[in-house]
Interface confidence: low
């Protein structure tokens, strides 16, 4: 708590300028009257205050507003927005897409941190949906927000947004989310050539159907075991072991300390047993040779 | 910051049930998704279940799906694993976590054991 103390005479600030960073923190807080402060906070942003500069500033706001910060102080709080609290934050009301995304490049190049994580919260609140242009901002900002959206409002990401995607973005994600971001990457990076083309949709395969992995076992990608190991069991099922081999190329004999685990283990159960011998992995639990193989799912089709 | 503190851990037989909870205290208000994971000896870290703070919606892995239920108490910052059916192969340190809307949760408990052994 900065101490109550008169301005010196002739200090009182008349301007939010460079001058007011030769000041001591009590004569900030004696000679610089908050309603300016507010009506100027475009030009904080430009004057290299010290943090402690900055902590003096910001007391003078939480001042004036305690209930919280109009949208047109909030717009121009710059680098003091990282002096806000979340508790702070959630005092606003923040309606604007320039004000978000002016805030967000305060920020930007950092982990989201919790201020940033409750502005949004508060702003996709205070908007009543994600729309896609607020989903555009926030994915190009931040490419791991898309992992703590819901399937249903995935849907509105745009394809463009997935060009900033990288892996390790997509490590929160679950299959649902991945079955909705699969085929927008894969429009996305539909123009790109065999092998950048993997490099890219690699780390959405968790939502690729069995046609896509087919193809790719035609193109020599070598898929590793770790990627193979999060595709869907359902998209795995049918391939063939031919098709496994050239999918992963000489990670295939990665499949052997997978077999108890899905989908490997559930594949393996799908797959004649004397196919699985060509593997030369000592895999186990195939089909026995000589046994009919039924496909209810063709025979319900035709009931 | 936000703490989290599980209980519920121990012993049990194959087929039995075991209740998991979280406690959760700090900065919550904010959180986006509160989950389980778990780690058995030897192994990475293992999603088990996961419910968005928002809206209530859940995922599970197929390992667990059908046997493991979460959900939460809001009023009692509570978070909590229903696991049925179990079996040996979860036994595992049980962990509670939460994270903002951001790509990795980044707030952890200490974990709870469950054995599931005869």
């Known amino acids: 708590e900065v101490e109550k103390t008169a301005c010196p005479s002739g200090k009182k600030a008349r301007e939010i300028d460079e001058s007011l960073i030769f000041y001591k923190k009590w004569e900030l807080e004696a000679c610089v009257d908050a309603a300016l402060l507010a009506t100027q906070m475009d030009r904080v942003n430009a004057i290299p205050f010290t943090y402690e500069q900055l902590d003096v500033l910001k007391h003078k706001l939480d001042e004036l507003y305690p209930q919280g910060y109009p949208e047109s102080v909030i717009q121009h709080l710059g680098y003091l927005f990282l002096k806000m609290s979340p508790e702070d934050i959630r005092k606003w009301n923040v309606t604007s897409l320039e004000t978000l995304k002016a805030l967000l490049e305060v920020n930007k190049g950092h982990e989201m941190s919790p201020q940033v994580a409750t502005l949004i919260d508060r702003f996709v609140k205070g908007r009543g949906q994600l729309d896609k242009d607020t989903l555009d901002t926030l994915t190009a900002f931040y490419p791991g927000y898309l992992c703590s959206l819901s399937p249903e409002e995935l849907s509105s990401v745009p394809p463009s947004s997935i060009w900033a995607v990288r892996p390790q973005d997509l490590d929160t994600c679950d299959p649902r989310q991945l079955d909705v971001l699969y085929p927008k990457a894969r429009l996305a990076f539909q123009n790109m050539n065999g092998s950048e083309y993997f490099v890219k949709i690699q780390s959405f395969l968790g939502g690729a159907p069995t046609e896509d992995l087919k193809a790719l076992s035609q193109q020599n990608v070598s898929m590793d075991l770790a990627t193979f190991m999060k595709l869907r069991t359902d998209a795995v099922l049918p391939l063939t072991v031919a098709e496994v081999q050239k999918l992963l190329g000489p990670h295939v004999e990665g499949l052997k300390a997978e077999e108890r685990h899905r989908p490997v283990r559930d594949w393996i159960l799908r797959q004649r047993q004397d196919d699985l011998d060509t593997l030369g992995l000592g895999l186990q639990g195939g089909i026995p040779n000589g046994y009919l193989v039924l496909d209810l799912s063709m025979q319900e089709a035709l009931s | 910051e936000v703490q989290l503190v599980e209980s519920g851990g121990g012993l049990v037989q194959p087929g039995g049930s075991l209740r998991l909870s979280c406690a959760a205290s700090g900065s919550i208000s904010s959180i986006y998704a509160m989950g389980w994971f778990r780690q058995a000896p030897g192994k990475g870290r293992e999603l088990v279940a996961t419910?968005?703070?928002?809206?209530?919606?859940?995922y599970y892995p197929d390992s667990v799906e059908g046997r493991f239920t979460i959900s939460r108490d809001n009023a009692k910052r509570m978070v909590y694993l229903q696991m049925n059916s179990l079996r040996a192969e979860d036994t595992a340190v049980y962990y509670c976590?939460?994270?903002?809307?951001?790509?990795?949760?980044?707030?952890w408990g200490q974990g709870t054991q469950v054995t599931v052994s005869s």
């Open positions: 419910i968005n703070t928002v809206d209530d919606i859940t």
């Open positions: 976590a939460a994270r903002y809307m951001t790509q990795s949760f980044s707030y």
